[in-house]
């Protein structure tokens, strides 16, 4: 059995304040069954950045077409970046359950925010 891989190819991304940041994440398999979620930070205090089914995330949009079949690209775009958005972002695969159980995290992508050019 090939083990599911959660791939965040960029270790770091630098974006100018006011611009959009793209955080890339792909998975190697459609199974196990379960959702992908994005978080900033790790551990119990981490902040949920994007979850398709629950919550309202007006600045975050999926990069891939939401009607694309058998999607394995879970990259997101965050608009209007501010210095407060700096941090390490993790793409996390969950196994479906009651509740869903965290299965595997990507290695993380550190987002740094540059001052807006004058």
């Amino acid at each position: 059995e090939e083990e599911l891989q959660v791939i965040q190819p960029e270790k770091s991304v630098s974006v100018a304040a006011g611009d959009s940041a793209t955080l890339n994440c792909t998975v190697s398999s459609l199974i196990p069954v379960g959702p992908i979620q994005w978080f900033r930070g790790a551990g119990p205090g981490r902040e949920l950045i994007y979850n398709l089914k629950e919550g309202h995330f007006p600045r975050v949009t999926p990069v891939s077409d939401p009607t694309k079949r058998n999607n394995m690209d879970f990259s997101i775009r965050i608009s209007n970046i501010t210095p407060a958005d700096a941090g390490t972002y993790y793409c996390v695969k969950f196994r479906k359950g009651s509740p869903d159980v965290e299965l595997k995290s990507g290695a993380g992508t550190e987002l740094s925010v540059r001052a807006k050019p004058s």
Partner: antibody
Framework: EVQLVESGGGVVQPGGSLRLSCAAS????????VSWVRQAPGKGLEWVST??????YYADSVKGRFTISRDNSKNTLYLQMNSLRAEDTAVYYC???????????????WGQGTLVTVSS | EIVLTQSPATLSVSPGERVTFSCRAS??????IAWYQQKPGQAPRLLIY???SRDTGIPDRFSGSGSGTDFTLTISSLQSEDFGVYYC??????????FGGGTKVEIK
């Protein structure tokens, strides 16, 4: 071309057992979830079970009696049915799961079905 | 468990007519609805997913709409090969996946 071919159906007495198989071809079997859906004579569709990797899901009506499994080396899906009841009589379809976007699963390809009759 | 209610149970239609099927969910399922066609003695066939996306090879006379709890499948001009039973399915919250009871389309 995606193909799903079920086998193993037949007549069995109440309390008996049966093992269904579904041979898959035309897609990368090992990376997709696959499911069993049944249809009692003259009735509608009822989901039975789904398997991802080692993750399995069952309808309450079959939990504890049916076991879904897969052999990726043989591209084959199985359904072991024990303690069969008259109400399990149905055509059993094997179905390939498909996902859309970041969302849940539906069934984009179906086999032709195999009839299971539970009768004394 | 999310219950899907399809109406009407049976439709008697003449070829060339416009046909509309209804599927109502007992709670919000967003757009996570699929529609299937089943002809007698055959397996179901996927028509629509994500409420409104046509599957590959499905004629454009089939269209789906709706979100939340109310969904519609429309056949703009019924062809003779379209007779059969139509089922909706939700995949927003599972297990279990649930199907509607079906709408049978028969010749008037």
């Amino acid at each position: 071309e995606v193909q799903l071919v079920e086998s193993g159906g037949g007549v069995v007495q109440p309390g008996g057992s049966l093992r269904l198989s579904c041979a898959a071809s035309g897609f990368s079997f090992s990376i997709y979830a696959v499911s069993w859906v049944r249809q009692a004579p003259g009735k509608g569709l009822e989901w039975v079970s789904t398997i991802g990797a080692d993750d399995t899901y069952y309808a309450d009506s079959v939990k504890g009696r049916f076991t879904i499994s897969r052999d990726n080396s043989k591209n084959t899906l199985y359904l072991q049915m024990n303690s069969l009841r008259a109400e399990d009589t149905a055509v059993y379809y094997c179905a390939k799961d498909s996902t859309v976007g970041w969302s849940g699963d539906f069934f984009d390809y179906w086999g032709q079905g195999t009839l299971v009759t539970v009768s004394s | 468990e999310i219950v899907l209610t399809q109406s009407p149970a049976t439709l008697s239609v003449s070829p060339g007519e416009r046909v509309t099927f209804s599927c109502r969910a007992s709670q919000n399922v967003r757009s996570d609805i699929a529609w299937y066609q089943q002809k007698p003695g055959q397996a179901p066939r996927l028509l629509i997913y994500a409420a409104s996306s046509r599957d590959t090879g499905i004629p454009d006379r089939f269209s789906g709409s709706g979100s939340g709890t109310d969904f519609t499948l429309t056949i703009s001009s019924l062809q003779s090969e379209d007779f059969g039973v139509y089922y909706c399915q939700q995949y927003y919250d599972w297990p279990p996946f649930t199907f509607g009871g079906g709408t049978k389309v028969e010749i008037k």
